[in-house]
Amino acid sequence: VPRWRQQWSGPGTTKRFPETVLARCVKYTEIHPEMRHVDCQSVWDAFKGAFISKHPCNITEEDYQPLMKLGTQTVPCNKILLWSRIKDLAHQFTQVQRDMFTLEDTLLGYLADDLTWCGEFNTSKINYQSCPDWRKDCSNNPVSVFWKTVSRRFAEAACDVVHVMLNGSRSKIFDKNSTFGSVEVHNLQPEKVQTLEAWVIHGGREDSRDLCQDPTIKELESIISKRNIQFSCKNIYRPDKFLQCVKNPEDSSCTSEI
C-alpha cells in the first residue's frame, strides 16, 4: 500500500537535483581556483543533510550551518552587487563586469540558483512531486530558509559602496517583502558599509522619467538612512548595452574601466 504523501502547493524538487548540485559544484570549483580545495561530495552530503528526513515546514538556518561552513568563500567585500526582481540583467552585468559579484556568483548561490528541493519527515526520500509554497504553505521551507541564510551572510560580508540593481519596470521598484527588502537591507553592516547605491534600470527606450523619485525608493532611502548608511540612487537607461556585452563578454566595451 503506497504511503500517504503530503501534497504541497509548490512545484516539487527539480528533477535530477542531487546530480545537478554535484555537477554544479564540480564545475564551479574547476573554474574558481580559490575554491579548488572544496570536496563536492561533502558539499552534497551537507546540503542533503539540511533537509532530508526533516519536515519541510520546519527547516531552520541551523540546518544549513554545515553547508555554510563548507561553502565559506571570500569575495571582495566592496564589489558586491545585490539585485531585486531583475536577476537576469544583474547576472549579465557581473558576467561581463568580472570584478563584481552577485550572490549567484558565489559557490552556494551558484549551486542552488533556480532549483527547488524538499524532503519528507522521517524518510530519506526527496519529494519530486511537490514542495511547500512560501505563501500558501509555510515560510520555513528548505528553499526559502536556504536563500534567507545565504542572503544574510552575503549582505553581512559587504563593505564600502554596495550596489543594488532594481527593476524600474515593476509597480514596486523596491519591495520590502523581497529577499533584498526583507533580508539583505537589514543585514548590511553600518560600520563597514558606507553607501548603498541603487541602480534603477529603465525598460522603455524612450523612458526619461526620474524613477529615483518613486515612493518605494524614498522608502528604501528612509530604511537605509535610519541604519546610518548613506543612500544614493541612479537612473540607468539603455540596458541593451549590457545585453550586447553578453554576446561578446571579452570585448573591451564590456568593462567599466576606461
Epitope: C233, S252, S253
Partner: antibody, heavy 120, light 107 residues
C-alpha cells in the same frame, strides 16, 4: 589605440544636404553605441544623435529630429550622419564620439571634428 | 528635460584648488561626466560616473555629485589645466545634455 576620423564637412547652402562619415579604428566598432556631438563657433557642446551598437535604436535631439539621420555600417567600421534641410544654425564642428560602456552614458573618445558651414 | 548650469568662468592661482560646479534638478539621480576642451581641440573625458577617472587623467582631477550639484575639483591646479570644462548627463530617451561650459583661467 582608438581613432575616430570625421569627414564630409564643408560649405553648403541653406536647405541643402550633406553626409558626414566617421571612420573608426582601434576598437570593436560593432560593440559600442556611437554619437554625433556638435559645437557652433565660440559656443558650447550640443549632443545631436546616438545609435545603438547594431543600429536598431536611434536617438535625436529635438533640434535635428526629422532632418538628420544617423546610421552605421559595422562591416566598414563607419558611422554616418545624413543632414538634410540644413539651416544656418546647423553651422558647427561635428564630432563623432564613442559611448562609454555598461551603466555609463557619456563619451569616452572623440574625433577631431569636421566643420559644416551653412551659408548662402 | 534637465538643464545643467555652470558658471561661465572660474579663476585660480597655480597650485591652488579649482572647483567648477554644475547644477540641475535632482542631478544626484543621474551620473555626471566632465570634459576638458582646449582651444582648437576635441573634448577629452576627465571624469565619468560622477567621480571615476579614466586612465591617463591625473589624480588631481576628482568629481562629486550630491543634491542638485555636481562638482569638478582640480587640486594643485597647473597652467596646462587652463581650458573650457563641460559637464554632461543623460536623463533617458533623447535627453542627453551638456552644461554651458566653464572657462578655467590659471592666473
Amino acid at each position: 589605440q582608438v581613432q575616430l576620423v570625421e569627414s564630409g564637412g564643408g560649405l553648403v547652402q541653406p536647405g541643402g544636404s550633406l553626409r558626414l562619415s566617421c571612420a573608426a579604428s582601434g576598437f570593436t566598432f560593432s560593440s559600442y553605441y556611437m554619437n554625433w556631438v556638435r559645437q557652433a563657433p565660440g559656443k558650447g557642446l550640443e549632443w545631436v544623435s546616438a545609435i545603438s551598437s547594431n543600429g536598431d535604436i536611434t536617438y535625436y535631439a529635438d533640434s535635428v529630429k526629422g532632418r538628420f539621420t544617423i546610421s552605421r555600417d559595422n562591416s566598414k567600421n563607419t558611422l554616418y550622419l545624413q543632414m538634410n534641410s540644413l539651416r544656418a544654425e546647423d553651422t558647427a564642428v561635428y564630432y563623432c564620439a564613442r559611448d562609454l560602456p555598461l551603466v555609463y552614458t557619456g563619451f569616452a573618445y572623440w574625433g577631431q571634428g569636421t566643420l559644416v558651414t551653412v551659408s548662402s | 528635460d534637465i538643464e545643467l548650469t555652470q558658471p561661465p568662468s572660474v579663476s585660480v592661482a597655480p597650485g591652488q584648488t579649482a572647483r567648477i560646479s554644475c547644477s540641475g534638478d535632482n542631478l544626484r539621480h543621474y551620473y555626471v561626466y566632465w570634459y576638458q576642451q582646449k582651444p582648437g581641440q576635441a573634448p577629452v573625458l576627465v571624469i565619468y560616473g560622477d567621480s571615476k577617472r579614466p586612465s591617463g587623467i591625473p589624480e588631481r582631477f576628482s568629481g562629486s555629485n550630491s543634491g542638485n550639484t555636481a562638482t569638478l575639483t582640480i587640486s594643485g591646479t597647473q597652467a596646462e589645466d587652463e581650458a573650457d570644462y563641460y559637464c554632461q548627463t543623460y536623463t533617458g530617451g533623447a535627453s542627453l545634455v551638456f552644461g554651458g561650459g566653464t572657462k578655467l583661467t590659471v592666473l
